[in-house]
Interface confidence: medium
């Protein structure tokens, strides 16, 4: 049988696994779709992205609201010409998440 | 031009994006490769998995050491025959990570 303390531990873990904005490491170049002769240093930044579990397999954790935050990064051209330049780069930051159907119910609508 | 304080902020962010064990939500059923007539509640647990950025595109963040931690979960059979039972489930927990080549340099060795 199981006691209330064990159930509390399980419930707390479940709450922590649920769909919510989580700090995630994203690669800037692939995020911005930049040309191959420009790259960023650091190549990655921390932002919040929706992640975690949904109760049903037919649902996926998706963002419902997004803000854009500015990160200061070095933009470097290859071959290296000027001293690396600090540029502000806007990256999507998920502020709200929800478990939503993987496809719209009425794809024809 | 950029001042040292700006660089410190960038440096701190970069440290946080680097390849290391990170708390991640994993789906137990796919982790264990369980049959479709058995599922777990909660369906997901939090464990540490390697994630983050590597300095070079040819490297990926991989685990170098792993421990197995036990999580108490309800194992449910479909169709439901008995009261859901609390079972200990062992899940891989990455304790060390490193940026390693995506493929060995000498595949023939």
């Amino acid at each position: 049988f199981y006691d209330i303390e064990t159930l509390k531990v399980i419930d707390e873990e479940w709450q922590r696994t649920q769909c919510s904005p989580r700090e995630t490491c994203v690669e800037v170049a692939s995020e911005l779709g930049k040309s191959t002769n420009t790259f960023f240093k650091p190549p990655c930044v921390n932002v919040f992205r929706c992640g975690g579990c949904c109760n049903e397999e037919s649902l996926i954790c998706m963002n419902t609201s997004t803000s854009y935050i500015s990160k200061q990064l070095f933009e470097i051209s290859v071959p290296l010409t000027s001293v690396p330049e600090l540029v502000p780069v806007k990256v999507a930051n998920h502020t709200g998440c929800k478990c939503l159907p993987t496809a719209p119910r009425h794809p024809y609508s | 031009f950029y001042d040292i304080e700006t660089l410190k902020v960038i440096d701190e962010e970069w440290q946080r994006t680097q390849c290391s064990p990170r708390e991640t939500c994993v789906e137990v059923a796919s982790e264990l490769g369980k049959s479709t007539n058995t599922f777990f509640k909660p369906p997901c647990v939090n464990v540490f998995r390697c994630g983050g950025c590597c300095n070079e595109e040819s490297l990926i963040c991989m685990n170098t050491s792993t421990s197995y931690i036990s999580k108490q979960l309800f194992e449910i059979s479909v169709p439901l025959t008995s009261v859901p039972e609390l079972v200990p489930v062992k899940v891989a927990n990455h304790t060390g990570c490193k940026c390693l080549p995506t493929a060995p340099r000498h595949p023939y060795s």
Epitope: T38, K41, P42, V83 | L7, W14
Partner: antibody
């Protein structure tokens, strides 16, 4: 407060190797995006960029002098070392250490190196 | 290499009067990222160069507003609206758009 100080021999004989050390404070070369470089100025003449080294140990050299120059760093000591081989009297100059930002904001006081037999 | 040509070589000035220095590059200094990395330094007698203007027209912190920079492409100008005695020294233009980063030959500003 950022400071950089050059040290090395004041006099070098032709064909010898010059070794200069830049000791800096107020920043760390392990900090992301940081660089240290060397610029020289012959007496009464223009400035000439020589080399620089980045936090990741990437190195860039003036192509004209590349074969004679080596730059290295000791992050724990806050030092950058420049070596220049096969010195010639035309290499007589004041050698400056700079913190590499775009543009160069912080410069050392410079050290005069004379090449003479 | 990008050649930076400064004129005049020497500039005798009267305190309170304006002064202008020209800098011409052998190639455009517009970087592929759109910025123009043309900077001006002043080297006072017996001192290291100090930054005055960066990226054509931006005054560095602490630089008096009598100093201004302008220009584009290959032609650039440093202006001093009213020269003061403390402005004497050698003025250098510099480009960091292309490697190797290069400097002009310098313009010596002295009081008449």
């Amino acid at each position: 407060q950022v400071t950089l100080k050059e040290s090395g021999p004041a006099l070098v004989k032709p064909t010898q190797t010059l070794t200069l050390t830049c000791t800096f404070s107020g920043f760390s070369l392990s900090t992301y995006g940081m660089g240290v470089g060397w610029i020289r100025q012959p007496p009464g003449k223009a400035l000439e960029w020589l080399a620089n080294i980045w936090w990741e140990d990437d190195k860039y050299y003036n192509p004209v002098l590349r074969s004679r120059l080596t730059i290295s760093k000791d992050t724990s000591k806050n030092q950058v070392v420049l070596t220049m081989t096969n010195m010639d009297p035309v290499d007589t100059a004041t050698y400056y250490c700079v913190q590499v930002t775009n543009p160069f904001v912080f410069w050392g006081q410079g050290t005069l190196v004379t090449v003479s037999s | 290499d990008i050649v930076m040509t400064q004129t005049p070589l020497s500039l005798p000035v009267t305190p309170g009067e304006p002064a202008s220095i020209s800098c011409r590059s052998s190639q455009s200094l517009v970087h592929i990222n759109g910025n123009t990395y043309l900077h001006w330094y002043l080297q006072k007698p017996g001192q290291s160069p100090q930054l005055l203007i960066y990226k054509v027209s931006n005054r560095f912190s602490g630089v008096p507003d009598r100093f201004s920079g302008s220009g584009s492409g290959t032609d650039f100008t440093l202006k001093i609206s009213r020269v003061e005695a403390e402005d004497v020294g050698v003025y250098f233009c510099s480009q960091s758009t292309h490697v190797p980063w290069t400097f002009g030959g310098g313009t010596k500003v002295e009081i008449k």
